[in-house]
């Protein structure tokens, strides 16, 4: 029962996480105009992965897509790629995990197959979450770098003609949505991997046989013999799960160069 709950909860958490990753990727507010020096601007700028927008005091909002591919910064392209990979992996993971759910019966699918599928989807969710977190963190790092560069050089000459105040950008709502969504997908993936452990059927235990010796009766349970078989099919499950554990380790050892953001 606990395994079913863990699997179901992992699925739901991952589903919410992937929905969040999709939402973050589509959102326009990845970076928003920093209003520290100008809190009463009548023109508010914000940018997404796909287009930049300007909201005017009049209520009019104008958005322009980035219609160039080669002219975009490599970092932005990398962030786009990470988010798309995260969405694709997450979507495949969701599809796999639906069939892996213990509460859903599909033909005569064995529990071992469901365990494998649960683990596969779990790993996919973990990688998906990592992609989203990495993508958002790379973008955040890019913003921090640009923010301090523009702070150090607040006034830049436009074509040598005139002095204009450079617009500074800070973290937009999409970054926080992305971080949370990536984290949820990651947690969901870990839960799926944990659920996988209890899903696989243990090799049928031999029934205890009583040997009646003269004088006193001793019951022998051939646990030692079972151990000598190497846990049968469980060896495979244990091994795969350990792989999942290594993925968890990867989460912990993931480069923390964005920690300061």
């Amino acid at each position: 029962m606990a395994v079913t709950a863990c699997q179901g909860l992992g699925f739901v958490v991952s589903l919410i996480g992937i929905a969040g990753i999709i939402a973050a990727t589509c959102m326009d507010q990845w970076s928003t105009q920093d209003l520290y020096n100008n809190p009463v601007t009548a023109v508010f700028n914000y940018q997404g992965l796909w287009r930049s927008c300007v909201r005017e005091s009049s209520g009019f909002t104008e958005c322009r897509g980035y219609f160039t591919l080669l002219g975009l910064p490599a970092m932005l392209q990398a962030v786009r790629a990470l988010m798309i990979v995260g969405i694709v992996l997450g979507a495949i993971g969701l599809l796999v995990s639906i069939f892996a759910l213990k509460c859903i019966r599909i033909g005569s699918m064995e529990d071992s197959a469901k365990a494998n599928m649960t683990l596969t989807s779990g790993i996919m969710f973990i990688v998906s979450g990592l992609c989203a977190i990495a993508g958002v963190s790379v973008f955040a790092n890019m913003l921090v770098t640009n923010f301090w560069m523009s702070t150090a050089n607040m006034y830049t000459g436009m074509g040598g003609m005139v002095q204009t105040v450079q617009t500074r950008y800070t973290f937009g709502a999409a970054l926080f949505v992305g971080w949370v969504a990536g984290g949820l997908t990651l947690i969901g993936g870990v839960m799926m991997c944990i659920a996988c452990r209890g899903l696989a059927p243990e090799e049928t235990n031999y029934k205890a046989v009583s040997y009646h010796a003269s004088g006193h009766s001793v019951a022998y349970k051939p646990g030692g013999f079972k151990a000598s078989t190497g846990f049968g099919s469980n060896t495979k499950n244990k091994k795969i799960y350990d792989g999942g554990a290594r993925t968890e380790d990867e989460v912990q050892s993931y480069p923390s160069k964005h920690d300061y953001v």
Partner: antibody, heavy 120, light 113 residues
């Protein structure tokens, strides 16, 4: 046809209060950001306050902040300016103006104005 | 606050001649987000409210004759009347539409020589 008609002006003593109204017609009032602009006796134009379509955001000239309150009743298509603690320097012709949706925050329609004289 | 400085204070031009009014802002009115300048020009005739002529520094408001044109970028802007007509006699104001408070220039009085 877009029409803005101001009312509520008159003579008031320093420290007194007054409420200006602006009746709007000929457009979807709730969609537009509205402003009050005044013209001093020296013919200088001075923006006073702005309120966005939904009424959630308001902006004020520093010298009127805390004394004037801009508000709107979208059901009645009316813009208001509540003026308290009036001073002699508030004497002006007060215009109600609409901020054009696609006019880069420019004021595309103006009323005829209502005169306020603050004097003892 | 952004200070808008108009020049000249008054201008006398012969009918059919070109009239040029300048406006300078203390801060840039250019928005990098959409590459637009947030400056408007208004015309005010005696006893009337101001009328919008130009917005976004160079876009003519609908119904405004094409003899009126706006130009400029960042902090320096110009309103040009290519061929002055008798009905163009008025006071012209420039306005910052970029940052609150939405400040106006002191105005330029245009007369016929």
């Amino acid at each position: 046809e877009v029409m803005l008609v101001e009312s509520g002006g008159g003579l008031v003593q320093p420290g007194g209060s007054l409420r200006l109204s602006c009746a709007a017609s000929g457009f979807t009032f709730s969609t537009y950001t509205m402003s009050w602009v005044r013209q001093t006796p020296e013919k200088r134009l001075e923006w006073v306050a702005t309120i966005v379509g939904g009424g959630g955001y308001t902006y004020y000239l520093d010298s009127v902040k805390g004394r004037f309150t801009i508000s709107r009743d979208n059901a009645k298509n009316t813009l208001y300016l509540q003026m308290n603690s009036l001073r002699a320097e508030d004497t002006a012709l007060y215009y109600c103006a609409r901020m054009g949706l696609t006019q880069r925050n420019a004021l595309d329609y103006w009323g005829q104005g209502t005169l306020i004289t603050v004097s003892s | 606050d952004i200070v808008m400085t108009q020049s000249p204070d008054s201008l006398a031009v012969s009918l059919g001649e070109r009239a040029t009014i300048n406006c300078k802002s203390s801060q840039s009115l250019f928005n990098s987000g959409n590459q637009k300048n947030y400056l408007a020009w208004y015309q005010q005739k005696p006893g009337q409210p101001p009328k919008l002529l130009i917005y976004g520094a160079s876009t003519r408001e609908s119904g405004v004759p094409d003899r009126f044109s706006g130009s400029g970028f960042g902090t320096d802007f110009t309103l040009t009347i290519s061929s002055l007509q008798a009905e163009d006699v008025a006071v012209y104001y420039c306005q910052n539409d970029h940052t609150y408070p939405l400040t106006f220039g002191a105005g330029t009085k245009l007369e016929i020589k």
